[in-house]
Amino acid sequence: AVNGTSQFTCFYNSRANISCVWSQDGALQDTSCQVHAWPDRRRWNQTCELLPVSQASWACNLILGAPDSQKLTTVDIVTLRVLCREGVRWRVMAIQDFKPFENLRLMAPISLQVVHVETHRCNISWEISQASHYFERHLEFEARTLSPGHTWEEAPLLTLKQKQEWICLETLTPDTQYEFQVRVKPLQGEFTTWSPWSQPLAFRTKPAALGKDT
């Protein structure tokens, strides 16, 4: 038997992936565990093997179909179970009725690129990945710019309260190396959270022209 507190948290990427993390205080030595998903009314079910990410937590991804296929809807309820092998049988360690569109975490934005760069300005665009058509335009973004001599944690957050897949960064220093990241969040869902940050995009502002103020 396993004692201690257990936490089972899952997020839906809005298309065909449910990512889960299971934390268990009591030690589980060399035990095989998995997450099993049973949606109401749908014929399919899916399983993934929990793999350790730290001493007391395990994670796995339920791949429900092709990356851009819409496998679940706003009315779906999925029974998620953590099952661990005990001898010849499986024991239910955690269970939840999972409402996918109340627990959203999208994929990080992709395809970041510099559209136009000047001495003090830079226009950057990106794309969202594997996001449901259900959202229409109901998304928001956060962006941050890494300046020389600072950390990402120190970077001020720029909030875009609409589905706007570009930004114009102002008041930059000429001939300076920067990095830029963006993340996305649907407006829908009680337990919805921000996507991971995108891969950083490195760019350099243009040098100031001699004798001119650009």
Partner: antibody, heavy 118, light 111 residues
């Protein structure tokens, strides 16, 4: 033994609101979907919508703008409201319990004939 | 829109076997489970088959169900027909948005 008993007004005028209630006796109220289905005279079955014990609803798109299904878990009851009725809404209305896993309607109310006439 | 199409009526003699089809219009009928209901005049429907091929207790084994994903259809087969089997039969499933869908119904006449 699970039983569903339904009641509500049987005669309405056009533009009025249809209101029906279904009481569930025996069995668990949570863990199921609670549905409304109708059947016009001499015709087939039409799903109106459903609600689960936590209050999440799903409605037939063709009726969605006029339908409200609500639940009172303390009384083991759920209700249907259909606004702006016309003669085309004349039908026998059934409440039913739908299984979570498969969506089977195992238990049905006795049915209420609702007639819309001026 | 996903629709389930059934023959309007079928008829057969007592003791014979009859099959009622239920064909999906688009998408896959195999993405959700299929139920079959029997409805006699003046009564609420009752389940004869659920989850494609399962019989509730009390339903005779003369009733069987199947789903064929290649033809995007489900079938209800009644063998050893009896006069008491005369009724309307409805298939039921879900579309991809989990809207419950009924077939138009099939009137079974036992000659």
């Amino acid at each position: 033994q699970v039983q569903l008993q339904q009641w509500g007004a049987g005669l309405l005028k056009p533009s009025e609101t249809l209101s029906l209630t279904c009481a569930v006796y025996g069995g668990s109220f949570s863990g199921y979907y609670w549905s409304w289905i109708r059947q016009p005279p001499g015709k087939g079955l039409e799903w109106i919508g459903e609600i689960n014990h936590s209050g999440s609803t799903n409605y037939n798109p063709s009726l969605k703008s006029r339908v409200t299904i609500s639940v009172d878990t303390s009384k083991n009851q759920f209700s249907l409201e259909l606004s702006s009725v016309t003669a085309a809404d004349t039908a026998v209305y059934y409440c039913a319990r739908a299984d979570r896993r498969f969506g089977e309607l195992r238990y049905w109310g006795q049915g209420t004939l609702v007639t819309v006439s001026s | 829109n996903f629709m389930l199409t059934q023959p309007h009526s079928v008829s057969e003699s007592p003791g014979k076997t009859v099959t009622i089809s239920c064909t999906g219009s688009s998408g896959s009928i195999a993405s959700s489970y299929v139920q079959w209901y029997q409805q006699r005049p003046g009564s609420a429907p009752t389940t004869v088959i659920y989850a494609d091929n399962q019989r509730p207790s009390g339903v005779p084994d003369r009733f069987s169900g199947s789903v064929d994903s290649s033809s995007n259809s489900a079938s209800l087969t009644i063998s050893g027909l009896k006069t008491e089997d005369e009724a309307d039969y409805y298939c039921q499933s879900f579309d991809s948005s989990l809207y419950m869908i009924f077939g138009g119904g099939t009137k079974l006449t036992v000659l």
